[in-house]
C-alpha cells in the first residue's frame, strides 16, 4: 500500500473521525432549519461541502472508486454520500436557472446519519429487506384492489353525481340551460338540495332503498361528483383510489354514506367485504410479513 | 332513448273541451316536473302549466281556473284537461319533462325531452 493509502485506512478505521462526520451532519442538520439564515451561514455551508468531500476522497483513498469488490461505489450507502457532494457542488457552482428544486436535495445530508449509527443501518436494512419481501403480498393487494374496483366500477359508476334537483324552475329554464350558466357555489345552492353545512348537494338515487330527495326536489344526475370530483368509481383509476381509501380506513364510512344513498343500502354487503378483506385481512398481512423481515434481520 | 308523445289535439268549438295527454316512453327512472308550452302562429313559445313529480302544480295567469294539469306516476304521462276554450288558445302544445333514463349501455342520463307538440284549433 502507499503511504497515502495507509494514512487513509487509519483515519478512516478511527472512531474521532465516526464522531466528525456524525457533528458535522447534525450541526449541518440544526442550520438547516433556519428560517432566515445569516450571510455567514454561507462560509458554513461551504466548511460542511469541505467535510463531505474530504470524507469521501478517505473513503476513496483507502477502499478504491469502483473497481474492485469492496470499493467506494459498491457499498449503496456511499452512492449517497456521492449524490450528497454532486448536488452540492451543482447548486454552488453551475448556473442551473431555478436551482429551488436542486437545494431540496441538500436534505439528503440528514440521510447521511443512517449510514454512521450503526443501529440505524441495522434498522434500516431490515425495512429495505422487508419490502424486498413485501413484493408478493403487494401483487396481492393490488390485484384484490384491482378486482374490487372493477367490481365496484360496475355497481356505482356515475352514482354519485346523482343530486336533488330544484323542481320549481322558471318557465323558460331547463337543466340544460341552468347548468351551462351556473359558477359560483351560491349559484348551485339555487337550484339543488344542500343539507346545511355540506358542501356538496344532497345525494339521492333510484332504487327503493337509495336516498330520496324531500319536497319540492327531484333526483337527477348532473354535475361533478362529491369532494371536488374526487369521489367517484367512474373511472377504474378513481374506483382504485376509493378501494384504497376504504382498505386504509381512510374517512371511508363517508365513502359508504354516500355510496349507499346514492346506490341503495343493499351495497353494504360490498362495503362489508372490502372491509373484511382489504382493511383487516391484508394489511395485517403485510404487518406479518414487515415483522418477519425485522425478526430475520435481528437473527 | 326517450320520447315524449302528444296527443289529444284537435278541433274544438269556443267554450268547448280537450283532453291532451303526454306519455314519456323508454327505460325511465324517474320524472322530475313535467310541463306544457304552446306556440301560436308567428308568436313565441310560451308556458302553460306545470306538474312536479309530488304533483305541485303552476299555471300561466292566461289559463289559470280553466285549464287543469294531473300525471300517472304509473304511465309516465301527464294531461291537460283545457276547459272553457277561447280562439287564443289556438296554437300548437308541446309537452316537455325532466327525465332520468336508462340510456346507453345501462348509464344514467338525466336531461331534458320534448315532444313533437300536437295542434289545438278553437275556431266556431
Known amino acids: 500500500f502507499s503511504p497515502l493509502r495507509r494514512i487513509s485506512i487509519k483515519i478512516l478505521v478511527h472512531s474521532l473521525f465516526s464522531m466528525l462526520i456524525m457533528c458535522t451532519i447534525l450541526t449541518n442538520c440544526i442550520f438547516m432549519t433556519m428560517n432566515n439564515p445569516p450571510d455567514w451561514t454561507k462560509n458554513v455551508e461551504y466548511t460542511f461541502t469541505g467535510i463531505y468531500t474530504f470524507e469521501s476522497l478517505v473513503k476513496i483513498l483507502a477502499r478504491g472508486f469502483c473497481v474492485g469488490e469492496f470499493t467506494f461505489l459498491r457499498d449503496p450507502w456511499n452512492w449517497l454520500d456521492f449524490v450528497v457532494i454532486v448536488f452540492a457542488y451543482l447548486t454552488e457552482f453551475v448556473n442551473l436557472g431555478n436551482v429551488s428544486a436542486l437545494r431540496t436535495f441538500r436534505v439528503l445530508r440528514a440521510l447521511k446519519t443512517i449510514s454512521v449509527i450503526p443501529g440505524l443501518k441495522t434498522i434500516v436494512g431490515a425495512l429495505i429487506q422487508s419490502v424486498k419481501k413485501l413484493s408478493d403480498v403487494m401483487i396481492l393487494t393490488v390485484f384484490c384492489l384491482s378486482v374490487f374496483a372493477l367490481i365496484g366500477l360496475q355497481l356505482f359508476m356515475g352514482n354519485l353525481k346523482h343530486k336533488c334537483f330544484r323542481n320549481s324552475l322558471e318557465n323558460n329554464e331547463t337543466l340544460e340551460s341552468i347548468m351551462n350558466t351556473l359558477e359560483s357555489e351560491e349559484d348551485f345552492r339555487k337550484y339543488f338540495y344542500y343539507l346545511e353545512g355540506s358542501k356538496d348537494a344532497l345525494l339521492c338515487g333510484f332504487s327503493t332503498d337509495s336516498g330520496q330527495c324531500p319536497e319540492g326536489y327531484t333526483c337527477v344526475k348532473i354535475g361533478r361528483n362529491p369532494d371536488y370530483g374526487y369521489t367517484s368509481f367512474d373511472t377504474f383509476s378513481w374506483a382504485f383510489l376509493a378501494l384504497f381509501r376504504l382498505m386504509t380506513q381512510d374517512y371511508w364510512e363517508n365513502l359508504y354514506q354516500q355510496t349507499l344513498r346514492a346506490a341503495g343500502k343493499t351495497y353494504m354487503i360490498f362495503f362489508v367485504v372490502v372491509i373484511f378483506l382489504g382493511s383487516f385481512y391484508l394489511i395485517n398481512l403485510i404487518l406479518a410479513v414487515v415483522a418477519m423481515a425485522y425478526e430475520e434481520q435481528n437473527q | 332513448e326517450v320520447q315524449l308523445v302528444e296527443s289529444g289535439g284537435g278541433v274544438v268549438q269556443p267554450g268547448g273541451s280537450l283532453r291532451l295527454s303526454c306519455a314519456a316512453s323508454g327505460r325511465i327512472l324517474r320524472i322530475g316536473y313535467m310541463r306544457w308550452h304552446r306556440q301560436g302562429a308567428g308568436k313565441q313559445r310560451e308556458f302553460v302549466a306545470r306538474i312536479t313529480d309530488d304533483s305541485a302544480t303552476d299555471y300561466a295567469d292566461s289559463v289559470k281556473g280553466r285549464f287543469t294539469i294531473s300525471r300517472d306516476n304509473a304511465k309516465n304521462t301527464v294531461y291537460l284537461q283545457m276547459n272553457s276554450l277561447r280562439p287564443e288558445d289556438t296554437a300548437l302544445y308541446y309537452c316537455?319533462?325532466?327525465?332520468?333514463?336508462?340510456?346507453?349501455?345501462?348509464?344514467?342520463?338525466?336531461?331534458?325531452?320534448w315532444g313533437q307538440g300536437t295542434l289545438v284549433t278553437v275556431s266556431s
Open positions: 316537455e319533462a325532466l327525465v332520468t333514463a336508462s340510456v346507453r349501455g345501462g348509464s344514467i342520463h338525466s336531461g331534458t325531452y
